[in-house]
């Protein structure tokens, strides 16, 4: 925030001796010193720390106040830590006092201490030790005080040392007015300060070229009586296609863009995009590259991925496992997924049609994030072609040919499906007659059925099997009054089907010659 300072005194600007008044003469001493940038300057130092009750005064020359009402005094000084001075803890101080005296003219070399008005006691934010001193860490304190309103033509400043070890490195006296500035891309003109100390003058700013006011937030500032611009409210921002450079808005260069006034800077066009004029608010995609609808303007234009690589398969009867490697080129995107297209092909013409909905895919057919899939429930002894396509967020925007990896296979003979409808036809003391239905999918010629049975309380520790070619069988030599578990599976050249669900049957008690049908106790799926 720029403030116009009208300098009335700047000790650092003076190359010759300052020749201020020191009283007593053995107190403040004018020496050549160095400022924080090691530039030679005139400084005053005092270090009368051995004796108590010090009262060393230093007075500036008479300062004409010009048009000022309120005066600012900036002091830069170093103060040595009393702990770094041996044996002076009782007498050493770490503050000094600042005074002023108003007068219409230079009153000469005599300091009349009683006429001076105290401004403040000045303490260091940072004092330094002997060790710091050695490293030339001259910890420069800056203190600003104000005086006024002043009524006379000028004044003196005076510094009273009461026993500190100080060097006054710089004394600057000035007044301020609000000067024309550009703030938040708005121009605020020179403004006369308010007459009262507390008054603030509100000034409305005008946006610089190619800037616009932020929505419902027009730029305003307040000029204080201290000559400072305060409380910026609102701002201007560079329009789309323009960026801030210092206090102006400049157009984005070629190959750069800015999509919104809310963005701070122009950005280089993302990869595979371009802008061929200045002041662009967006970049166009190169041929063959696209932006997905959800892609923000700052992301690179991308393209569909190449085909998956190294597609391999494994056939297990009517199940096919496919596995592949990611595409060599993901198109510049991280949202690559895979989709599987299954086609069943005829033996003769080689014509292929989509497989239909009765095929199973594990984990899924589309949106696959992993690079493997299992295709189940295929027909036995059938020809299939599987196309594995990598897709990303811009695949559907591309009109170019699909890229995929394909493999053609022939399924083997499948094992039969599960036997169903197992029924108890007759139950005796030592025999049970069962019947069942052929599997829904025999997947070939059923050569026989295998019946597995065991006493329920044996829990399949020992079981017996019986084979039959028909869909019924009588199981003999059973124990009377015993619960048996029965399961049946079909057998083809391709192998064994899954066992049917368990069927519990209780044979009749030996004492009773009565015939009745035992009831099923439970029924559950039991794998092969």
């Amino acid at each position: 925030q720029a403030a116009k300072e009208v300098l009335l005194l700047d000790s650092k600007a003076q190359q010759t001796e300052l020749e201020w008044i020191s009283s007593p003469p053995s107190g403040w001493e004018e020496i050549s010193g160095l400022d924080e940038n090691y530039t030679p300057i005139r400084t005053y130092q005092v270090c009368q720390v051995m004796e108590p009750n010090q009262n060393n005064w230093l007075r500036t020359n008479w300062i004409s106040k010009g048009n000022a009402q309120r005066i600012f005094v900036e002091l830069k000084f170093t103060l040595r830590d009393c702990n770094s001075l041996p044996g002076v803890l009782g007498t050493c101080k770490e503050t000094f006092n600042l005074y002023y005296y108003e007068t219409d003219y230079d009153t000469g070399r005599n300091i009349r201490e009683n006429l001076y008005v105290k401004i403040d006691t000045i303490a260091a934010d940072e004092s330094f030790t002997q060790g710091d001193l050695g490293e030339r860490k001259m910890k420069l304190n800056t203190e600003v005080r104000e005086i006024g309103p002043l009524s006379k033509k000028g004044f003196y400043l005076a510094f009273q040392d009461v026993g500190a070890c100080i060097a006054l490195v710089s004394v600057k006296v000035y007044y301020k007015k609000c000067w024309s500035i550009v703030e938040n891309l708005a121009v605020f003109p020179d403004t006369v300060t308010g007459s009262e100390f507390s008054s603030l003058v509100e000034v409305r700013g005008t946006c610089v070229s190619s800037a616009e006011e932020e929505a419902e937030n027009s730029p305003r500032m307040h000029c204080s009586a201290e000559g400072e611009w305060l409380v910026p409210i609102g701002k201007c921002i560079c329009k789309a296609g323009y960026q801030q450079k210092g206090d102006t808005c400049e157009p984005c260069g070629r190959r750069f863009y800015k999509s919104s006034s809310q963005d701070l800077q122009c950005s280089r066009c993302p990869t595979h995009s371009f802008s061929d004029r200045e002041g662009s608010s967006r970049c166009e995609c190169e041929d063959g590259y696209y932006r997905a609808p959800s892609d923000p303007p700052y992301v690179a234009c991308t393209r569909p991925p190449s085909a998956p690589q190294n597609l391999i398969f494994n056939i297990n009867q009517t199940t096919v496992s496919l596995e592949w490697s990611p595409p060599a080129d993901n198109g510049g995107r991280n949202d690559v997924t895979y989709r599987i297209l299954c086609k069943r092909c005829s033996w003769e013409q080689g014509e292929c049609v989509p497989c239909g909905s009765n095929i199973g895919y594990m984990p899924q057919q589309t949106g696959l994030e992993d690079n493997y899939v299992t295709v189940m429930d295929l027909l036995a002894h059938a020809n299939y072609t599987f196309e594995v396509e990598a897709v990303n967020g811009v695949s559907d925007l591309s009109r170019s040919q699909r890229l995929f990896a394909a493999v053609s296979i022939t399924t083997g003979q499948a094992a039969p499906s599960q036997v169903s409808g197992v029924m108890k036809e007759r139950v005796l003391q030592r025999s049970v007659q069962l019947s069942w239905q052929e599997p829904e999918h025999p997947n070939g010629v059923i050569t026989e059925y295998e019946i597995k049975y065991y006493e329920k309380d044996q829990r399949e520790r020992t079981y017996s099997t019986l084979k039959t070619k028909s869909t019924s069988a009588s199981i003999n030599n059973l124990k009377p009054g015993t619960v048996y578990v029965f399961q049946i599976r079909a057998v083809t050249a391709a192998g064994y089907g899954n066992y049917s669900p368990r069927l519990d049957v209780a044979t009749l008690e030996e004492a009773s010659g009565k015939m009745f049908e035992a009831t099923a106790v439970s029924s559950e799926q039991n794998p092969v």
Epitope: S26, C47, M50, E51, G87, V88, L133, G134, C165, A167
Partner: antibody
């Protein structure tokens, strides 16, 4: 003009004592500390210690405790160095020097002309 | 205690030449170092304090630098009255002098 005035040469026998005065003028005596420095014939400078002229509190360097005593008489702006049980190796020029503390560093800015103390049997 | 070692012990220069004297401390003394000049039969004279600050009245041909353990006193153009012994002195909790460097006419 700031000055430190020391007494003339002293010749002493071993075991004797000597008191070397250092009279200050041209400044407020109690506003600056006073240091003592020894220089044996043909040798370098050796700092013996210093005394706070305001409080009278002395500080002695290593090797200068016991036989060496710093004292003051502020009424006549004079600092004293007393050496007891003199030995031949105490033969040297003894300087008083005003200590200057400043913001930028410390040093001995005003020196007396020195007092030669000769210890000989 | 901190030991100060000055080098060289003797430096032979012609008037108008540059003289560079070195002082090394056995441990860091920050910049708590002063330089003194002593002519035969005279008391020492303070040349530099705070490692690099010149008191009023010391000619600007004398300059000094350094901090920590390594310090240098430079006489840019040696005048006839500069032939003397120069001592460095550190002022930490206890003060010590270096053994001195004699600057003599070449």
């Amino acid at each position: 003009q700031v000055q430190l005035l020391q007494s003339g040469a002293e010749v002493k026998k071993p075991g004797a004592s000597v008191k070397v005065p250092c009279k200050a003028s041209g400044y407020t005596f109690t506003s600056r500390a006073m240091s003592w420095v020894r220089q044996a014939p043909g040798q370098g400078l050796e700092w013996m210690g210093w005394i706070n002229t305001n409080t009278g509190n002395p500080t002695y360097a290593q090797g200068f405790t016991g036989r060496f005593v710093f004292s003051l008489d502020t009424s006549v702006s004079t600092a004293y160095l007393q050496i007891s049980s003199l030995k031949a190796e105490d033969t040297a020029v003894y300087y008083c020097a005003r200590v200057r503390f400043t913001v930028y560093g410390d040093g001995m800015d005003v020196w007396g002309q020195g007092t030669l103390v000769t210890v000989s049997s | 205690e901190i030991v100060l070692t000055q080098s060289p012990a003797t430096l032979s220069v012609s008037p108008g030449e540059r003289a560079t004297l070195s002082c090394r401390a056995s441990q860091s003394v920050s910049s708590n170092l002063a330089w003194y000049q002593q002519k035969p039969g005279q008391a020492p004279r303070l040349l530099i304090y705070g490692a690099s600050t010149r008191p009023t009245g010391i000619p600007d041909r004398f300059s000094a630098s350094g901090s920590g353990t390594d310090f240098t006193l430079t006489i840019s153009r040696v005048e006839p009255e500069d032939f003397a012994v120069y001592y460095c002195q550190q002022y930490g909790p206890s003060w010590t002098f270096g053994q001195g460097t004699k600057v003599e006419i070449k």
